[in-house]
């Protein structure tokens, strides 16, 4: 029960992470205009991973794309890689882990079959939530290097004739939400891996044993299957670590692909 | 077409408060700021500030700070500018803009204060 | 506050002549973010609302014609009539967009000779 809530509520927490690192890296405010040195501007700009924008005093927002691949900076590029691969690997992370989540049937899985793939969807929330939590930290890294830079150069002068206040860029919303996107991911992660641990079948220390009795030859075999029918059909052996505690008849019925328990 | 349709003429005495109305149409209403500005008799123009629909977010001129309230009503799109404690330097055609650039304008109304 | 100042306060040209009014602002208008000018050109009519004719420097608004043109950048700011028509008569504003409070300058009055 405890292995089921763990995977659950780590598969849960990973969708949230991941549905955060998707918004994140489409949200245009990876950078907001600091406003500490020109408080009363009629004009904001923002910057996202994608485009720039420009909220004016009518209200009106105007983004414009960076239609160029060359001309953008590598860490921007860099950036936009780690946040994409952060994105396709949990993508493909929560695939495996719907397919190897304890309270869904498919077929006659395995379980140790769910257990790895538990352990894989696990290692792939990791992965891409350190790919968030990098990505946005080696943006927000980026940033504090220009605003002191900025700082330190605050004015620049237009052809040497006009001068003019440098637009200093402080943390936007989205590295805020792609720090906790990419820690939700993370810990949804470790959950996945722990949870994995539970579904494991444990292996017996026992080799087999061939117990002889008068009339019936049975032979019982480690992994908890029987090896023969003397006992008649009343006894069903049940594999202990099955969560659907399918006996082997009901292996013979052919269940849906789905079977929802 | 954008349209923005101000009350009409107003006489009001020293001290009195009035309410100018701006109603809307043509646009969504909560895209865009709505500017108030002024312009005395033979005078040019003053801004005394904004409010957003949207979000209902407001910058006054600071000339005028404690003496305007602007305030709107999103489901008639009207915006209010109401100037208080009223002065005869206050006497002017009050006008609402909104758009890009100031694009559109109100038709303007007319406030005279006078004892 | 920035402070809007044109030139001339009147101008009185011929009619298919060049006008050529100035605006200067006490600060830069312009918009490192995405390069602009936040300076916005109006014309107004007696008895009329102002109507716009400039925003960001340069960019005509829509309807407006391209006789008018305006140019500039940081603090000096042209608007140019190409060849005046006696409908251009009017008071010209010139109005700092970038920074609040937003500020009008005082108007150039033209006419015509």
């Known amino acids: 029960m405890a292995v089921t809530a763990c995977q659950g509520l780590g598969f849960v927490v990973s969708l949230i992470g991941i549905a955060g690192i998707i918004a994140a890296t489409c949200m245009d405010q990876w950078s907001t205009q600091d406003l500490y040195n020109n408080p009363v501007t009629a004009v904001f700009n923002y910057q996202g991973l994608w485009r720039s924008c420009v909220r004016e005093s009518s209200g009106f927002t105007e983004c414009r794309g960076y239609f160029t691949l060359l001309g953008l900076p590598a860490m921007l590029q860099a950036v936009r890689a780690l946040m994409i691969v952060g994105i396709v690997l949990g993508a493909i992370g929560l695939l495996v882990s719907i397919f190897a989540l304890k309270c869904i049937r498919i077929g006659s899985m395995e379980d140790s079959a769910k257990a790895n793939m538990t352990l894989t969807s696990g290692i792939m929330f990791i992965v891409s939530g350190l790919c968030a939590i990098a990505g946005v930290s080696v943006f927000a890294n980026m940033l504090v290097t220009n605003f002191w830079m900025s700082t330190a150069n605050m004015y620049t002068g237009m052809g040497g004739m006009v001068q003019t206040v440098q637009t200093r860029y402080t943390f936007g919303a989205a590295l805020f939400v792609g720090w906790v996107a990419g820690g939700l991911t993370l810990i949804g992660g470790v959950m996945m891996c722990i949870a994995c641990r539970g579904l494991a079948p444990e292996e017996t220390n026992y080799k087999a044993v061939s117990y002889h009795a008068s009339g019936h030859s049975v032979a019982y075999k480690p992994g908890g299957f029987k090896a023969s029918t003397g006992f008649g059909s009343n006894t069903k052996n049940k594999k202990i670590y099955d969560g659907g505690a399918r006996t082997e008849d009901e292996v013979q019925s052919y269940p849906s692909k789905h079977d929802y328990v | 077409q954008v349209q923005l349709v101000q009350s009409g003429a107003e006489v009001k005495k020293p001290g009195a408060s009035v309410k100018v109305s701006c109603k809307a149409s043509?646009?969504?209403?909560?895209?865009?700021?709505i500017h108030w500005v002024r312009q005395a008799p033979g005078q040019g123009l003053e801004w005394i500030g904004y409010?957003?629909?949207?979000?209902?977010?407001?910058n006054y001129n600071l000339k005028f700070k404690d003496r305007a309230t602007m305030t709107s009503d999103t489901s008639i799109s009207t915006a209010y500018m109401e100037l208080s404690r009223l002065r005869s330097d206050d006497t002017a055609v009050y006008f609402c803009?909104?758009?890009?650039?100031?694009?559109?304008w109100g038709q303007g109304t007319l406030v005279t204060v006078s004892s | 506050d920035i402070v809007m100042t044109q030139s001339p306060d009147s101008l009185a040209v011929s009619p298919g002549e060049r006008a050529t009014m100035s605006c200067k602002s006490s600060?830069?208008?312009?918009?490192?973010?995405?390069?602009?000018?936040?300076l916005i050109w109006y014309q107004q009519k007696p008895g009329q609302p102002p109507k716009l004719l400039i925003y960001?420097?340069?960019t005509r608004d829509s309807g407006v014609p391209d006789r008018f043109s305006g140019s500039g950048s940081g603090t000096d700011f042209t608007l140019t009539i190409s060849s005046l028509q006696a409908e251009d008569v009017a008071v010209y504003y010139c109005q700092n967009d970038y920074s609040y409070p937003l500020t009008f300058g005082g108007g150039t009055k033209l006419e015509i000779k």
């Open positions: 600060q830069s208008l312009f918009n490192s973010g995405n390069q602009k000018n936040y």
């Open positions: 409010i957003s629909p949207g979000n209902g977010g407001s």
């Open positions: 803009a909104t758009g890009r650039g100031f694009a559109y």
């Open positions: 960001r420097a340069s």
């Open positions: 043509g646009f969504t209403f909560t895209s865009y700021n």
